[in-house]
């Protein structure tokens, strides 16, 4: 637009002029005026501020609490907040990984489609016909049920979702 | 304070190219656009175009629509101005300057608060 | 594209006189209109914005009026370091264009 009608992109409007934002990582001071230009600060250590801005306090960096399960994934900046992530067997609660909880396990006969992270918990499936789980676990996959036909055997026990196929010698009495 | 301080001056042959620097301090760089102005020895004042140092976008006048090139790098605070194709009257100094905005009566007012002190670049066989 | 038609183009003057320059704009620009002040071998200095806004550390001798397509710089009483070529540059449409310039001499 010719000519302007607003203050450019990184611009803030405070009396009557159009002042420059802090740049990520630091915080304001003082506003522009006729004579002087914008002032701003580089955030203190464990503070951060990650957009343009006109902010007079830069925020804290997120604490990554171990009492909670927490543990720092990636060191915050001036720029950037601190990333926390869950320890070992456990995954966070929300989006915002504020606590932790132990990751699920899938119970008999169900198995494992998706493996636990940091963020997000283990996703069971019921074991489909011809497969079965016999454990509590948060890792093992529906195992398939033995081929008693390759062993040259004969299922003596159907098999579950839960348990496997018993195979036994076949009839020789039979014709 | 603020300051805009230009390279220094060049002599170029026709169909050459110059690239003018324009190093500013004092300000955020990326917070206020740059135009560029030129000169022809006691002549007036030709405006040329702008960059938004934030995103690195540019806006030509059309008379210098596919010949000048306007860029930026944020990391050194420094915007440039490459014309090509030079002709002698290309010949001028050419200047950088800081938009200001003003709101006044509901409307956004720019001007150019400040200016680097010129590059003169000659262009001659 | 607009046309800026300053004048005078030359005009010599005296210390302590009472200076005008106009500046008449080929279309209408409502009050986008700014003043330059530029001596030998220097770069031009923003002395009014706005058509009449005084620009931070500039002289209260300086005063800028009008708008739509006729403007004017009055300087009050010259100074000698007033001595100097001024250009209005309108800011309402592409390209921004100046004024050819005023130069002001002694007399």
């Known amino acids: 637009p010719e000519p302007p009608t607003a203050c450019r992109e990184k611009q803030y409007l405070i009396n009557s002029q159009c002042c420059s934002l802090c740049q990520p990582g630091q915080k304001l001071v003082s506003d522009c005026t006729e004579f002087t230009e914008t002032e701003c600060l580089p955030c203190g250590e464990s503070e951060f501020l990650d957009t343009w801005n006109r902010e007079t306090h830069c925020h804290q960096h997120k604490y990554c609490d171990p009492n909670l399960g927490l543990r720092v994934q990636q060191k915050g900046t001036s720029e950037t907040d601190t990333i926390c992530t869950c320890e070992e067997g456990w995954h966070c609660t929300s989006e915002a990984c504020e606590s932790c909880v132990l990751h699920r396990s899938c119970s008999p006969g169900f198995g494992v489609k998706q493996i636990a992270t940091g963020v997000s918990d283990t996703i069971c499936e019921p074991c489909p016909v011809g497969f079965f789980s016999n454990v509590s676990s948060a890792f093992e996959k529906c195992h398939p049920w033995t081929s008693c036909e390759t062993k040259d055997l004969v299922v003596q026990q159907a098999g579950t979702n839960k348990t496997d196929v018993v195979c036994g010698p076949q009839d020789r009495l039979r014709a | 304070q603020v300051q805009l301080v230009q390279s220094g001056a060049e002599v170029k042959k026709p169909g050459a190219s110059v690239k003018v620097s324009c190093k500013a301090s004092?300000?955020?760089?990326?917070?206020?656009?740059m135009y560029w102005v030129r000169q022809a020895p006691g002549q007036g004042l030709e405006w040329m175009g702008w960059i938004n140092p934030d995103s690195g976008a540019p806006t030509y006048a059309q008379k210098f629509q596919g010949r000048v090139t306007m860029t930026r790098d944020t990391s050194i605070s420094t915007a440039y101005m490459e014309l090509s194709r030079l002709r002698s009257d290309d010949t001028a100094v050419y200047y950088c300057?800081?938009?200001?905005?003003?709101?006044?009566?509901?409307?956004?007012?720019?001007?150019?608060?400040?200016w680097g002190q010129g590059t003169l670049v000659t262009v001659s066989s | 594209d607009i046309q800026l038609t300053q004048s005078p183009s030359f005009l010599s003057a005296s210390v302590g006189d009472r200076v005008t320059i106009t500046c008449r704009a080929s279309q209408g620009i409502s009050s986008y209109l700014a003043w330059y002040q530029q001596k030998p071998g220097k770069a031009p200095k923003l002395l009014i914005y706005a058509a009449s806004t005084l620009q931070s550390g500039v002289p209260s001798r300086f005063s800028g009026s009008g708008s739509g397509t006729e403007f004017t710089l009055t300087i009050s009483s010259l100074q000698p370091e007033d001595f100097a070529t001024y250009y209005c540059q309108q800011l309402d449409s592409y390209p921004w264009t100046f004024g050819q310039g005023t130069k002001v001499e002694i007399k």
């Open positions: 300057a800081r938009e200001k905005i003003y709101y006044g009566s509901g409307n956004y007012y720019p001007s150019f608060d400040y």
């Open positions: 004092g300000y955020t760089f990326a917070g206020y656009y």
